[in-house]
Amino acid sequence: LPAQVAFTPYAPEPGSTCRLREYYDQTAQMCCSKCSPGQHAKVFCTKTSDTVCDSCEDSTYTQLWNWVPECLSCGSRCSSDQVETQACTREQNRICTCRPGWYCALSKQEGCRLCAPLRKCRPGFGVARPGTETSDVVCKPCAPGTFSNTTSSTDICRPHQICNVVAIPGNASMDAVCTSTSPTRSMAPGAVHLPQPVSTRSQHTQPTPEPSTAPSTSFLLPMGPSPPAEGSTGD
């Protein structure tokens, strides 16, 4: 039979590969059928009989066409700080990802091995760089004219309100308090340029300090706990 219509197992022509979804069995010296995802080779092929495939057992899988004697074990159940984004099936491994408010500190090929809580910036500090699936929040001190009065992994430094008459000047962790019933106007959050305030408090325009790059947790360090990074707070 020509190679295109031969049935497995068959001996390939010298110098020819096996065809689609076939493998060359060194022992039988034949092209034999692979097993489809979700199956494994229960009996290997011989010169006269093709591969016998069988379904993967519970909690095991094969994702690719294969001729492995045993399916792979699915990963352990997701931990409490994770959510299962892909269940363990006969064709795919379980995938665990970090739940909201956490990020992946140690990833694996698919999903996350170890999640850590997102750093919370304490009052006087705002979020310089938000957390992502794989990186922690970076906090920065609030620049003059801005403040943050929360302990948060999402809040940025906001501009002080502009007062006609200031009762209590604002600082890095507190908004200005006005004596009048309402301020003339309030700056939009995240405004880039701060106009000169109508208040007695002098505000120097100075560059914002570089975001802190200190790690938020010490769970990967072998030397024991360390104090929290500047501007961050532990849970």
């Epitope: 110098g15 020819s16 590969t17 065809r19 690719l64 066409w65």
Partner: antibody, heavy 119, light 107 residues
Framework: QVQLVQSGAEVKKPGASVKVSCKAS????????INWVRQATGQGLEWIGW????????QYAQKFQGRVTMTRNTSISTAYMELSSLRSEDTAVYYC????????????WGQGTTVTVSS | DIQMTPSTSSLSASVGDRVTITCRAS??????LNWYQQKPGKAVKLLIY???KLHSGVPSRFSGSGSGTDFTLTISSLQPEDFATYYC?????????FGGGTKLELK
């Protein structure tokens, strides 16, 4: 990134042979088939065959059997496709493409090499 | 050999349209159907493999469906960069064969 870079355009006379090269980078060359596909002007795509770079074994479409030879040089991650006894109908753009033998798809393509057969 | 036939060789559509391109195989090819995009002077791009699996880096507006002999590529909301020629290809048996291509043009 994964890339396939092909040799430049060729003009050949009927009856002659042409050899097109395809240099792979950005992945382990020997672990994926390199397929060759051609496209005549204004026409569809036509599969010629593949070579498995690890052992140099090939699989050709019956239409091209006896006229096509696929080879490789693993030390420079390059595959070659030689087509002999050229005729005017072989005028086409020839592509190399990395292939998957389980699903039969081509996930990375070269930029193409124009081969013109004219007397 | 398995023949692959697109329902139409050209198609006109506008940005934002939902577009479907269909392809028929001359015999059952299970789910072994792949879709490609080709633009003039650019390398051919794999979009969908095994009928409905999205190739890495391909926008989620592309999707594939069908079974046996009839298959569809859908673009949920056409973008300016989607105007191109689309090819279906069967990966069921050798020789691997392509459809004639559907040119997607601006209306």
């Amino acid at each position: 990134q994964v890339q396939l870079v092909q040799s430049g355009a060729e003009v050949k006379k009927p009856g002659a042979s042409v050899k097109v090269s395809c240099k792979a980078s950005g992945y382990t060359f020997i672990t994926y088939d390199i397929n060759w596909v051609r496209q005549a002007t204004g026409q569809g795509l036509e599969w010629i065959g593949w070579i498995y770079p690890r052992d140099g074994n090939t699989q050709y479409a019956q239409k091209f059997q006896g006229r096509v030879t696929m080879t490789r040089n693993t030390s420079i991650s390059t595959a070659y496709m030689e087509l002999s006894s050229l005729r005017s109908e072989d005028t086409a753009v020839y592509y190399c493409a990395r292939g998957d033998r389980d699903y039969g798809y081509f996930d990375v393509w070269g930029q193409g090499t124009t081969v013109t057969v004219s007397s | 050999d398995i023949q692959m036939t697109p329902s139409t060789s050209s198609l006109s559509a506008s940005v934002g349209d939902r577009v479907t391109i269909t392809c028929r195989a001359s015999q059952d090819i299970s789910n072994y159907l792949n879709w490609y995009q080709q633009k003039p002077g650019k390398a051919v791009k794999l979009l969908i493999y095994f009928k409905s699996k999205l190739h890495s880096g391909v926008p989620s507006r592309f999707s594939g469906s069908g079974s046996g002999t009839d298959f569809t590529l859908t673009i949920s909301s056409l973008q300016p960069e989607d105007f191109a020629t689309y090819y279906c290809q069967q990966g069921n048996t050798l020789p691997l064969t392509f459809g004639g291509g559907t040119k997607l043009e601006l209306k």
